[in-house]
């Protein structure tokens, strides 16, 4: 079974800068899985942000601006990354990655 680790316990960024979060997949080939990213803002329900499928297809929450989040995966390091562009106060949240085994 697959296992996920988010090595960064926290990330502090200056407003308008870019944040990059990592999710390390083990126990399964990342290219054979779909990785999902969610965020939980303080006092709010968890929200789907973006995913990348085994075939590279990217899906995002349609209400989120197209340039806000970027998802990728690096098979060499078995890592999925979530890039948050133009960081603002509304981006303060806990970010979770999740795995769908195909």
């Amino acid at each position: 079974a697959g296992h996920l680790e988010q090595p960064q316990i926290s990330s502090t960024k200056t407003l308008s800068k870019t944040a990059r979060l990592e999710c390390v997949v083990s126990g399964i080939t990342i290219s054979a899985t779909s990785v999902y990213w969610y965020r939980e803002r303080p006092g709010e329900v968890i929200q789907f942000l973006v995913s990348i499928s085994y075939d590279g297809t990217v899906r995002k929450e349609s209400g989120i601006p197209s340039g806000k989040f970027e998802v990728d995966r690096i098979p060499e390091t078995s890592t999925s990354t979530l890039t948050i562009h133009n960081v603002e106060k509304q981006d303060i949240a806990t970010y979770y990655c999740a795995l769908w085994e195909v």
Epitope: G56, T57, V58, S66, G67
Partner: nanobody, 125 residues
């Protein structure tokens, strides 16, 4: 609402090239991932190529990889499909499509929010 209008289709000989263009209007173009599909008579609509919202990521069906190139110009609200080394089996109606939420070969037809009316491509000697 987004309007998509394809152009550039026509009759071309085997081995020839065509450049299809899709002009978008009515909304913010960069909010949409774009793709090209084709549909031959009595066949299903098939995915050919897609380009992400920013243009930074492209995807291709195996049948056109190395022959077709997709690109987008967010300043001009257009997406293009350069088609080289055309074969008779490339004959079909070609459609562009726009999706707010999905980019890539795995997007279902239902995940595309808008479609063009199509442009005919015929490859024949």
């Amino acid at each position: 609402e987004v309007q998509l209008v394809e152009s550039g289709g026509g009759l071309v000989q085997p081995g020839g090239s065509l450049r299809l263009s899709c002009a978008a209007s009515g909304s913010i173009f960069s909010n949409y991932a774009m793709a090209w599909f084709r549909q031959a008579p009595e066949k299903e609509r098939d995915f050919l190529a897609a380009v992400s919202w920013s243009g930074g990521r492209t995807y291709y069906a195996d049948s056109v990889k190395g022959r077709f190139t997709i690109s987008r110009d967010n300043a001009k609200n257009t997406v293009n499909l350069q088609m080289n080394s055309l074969k008779p089996e490339d004959t079909a109606v070609y459609y562009c499509a726009a999706s707010l939420s999905c980019s890539g070969p795995g997007c279902s037809l239902e995940e595309y929010d808008y479609w063009g009316q199509g442009t005919q491509v015929t490859v024949s000697s």
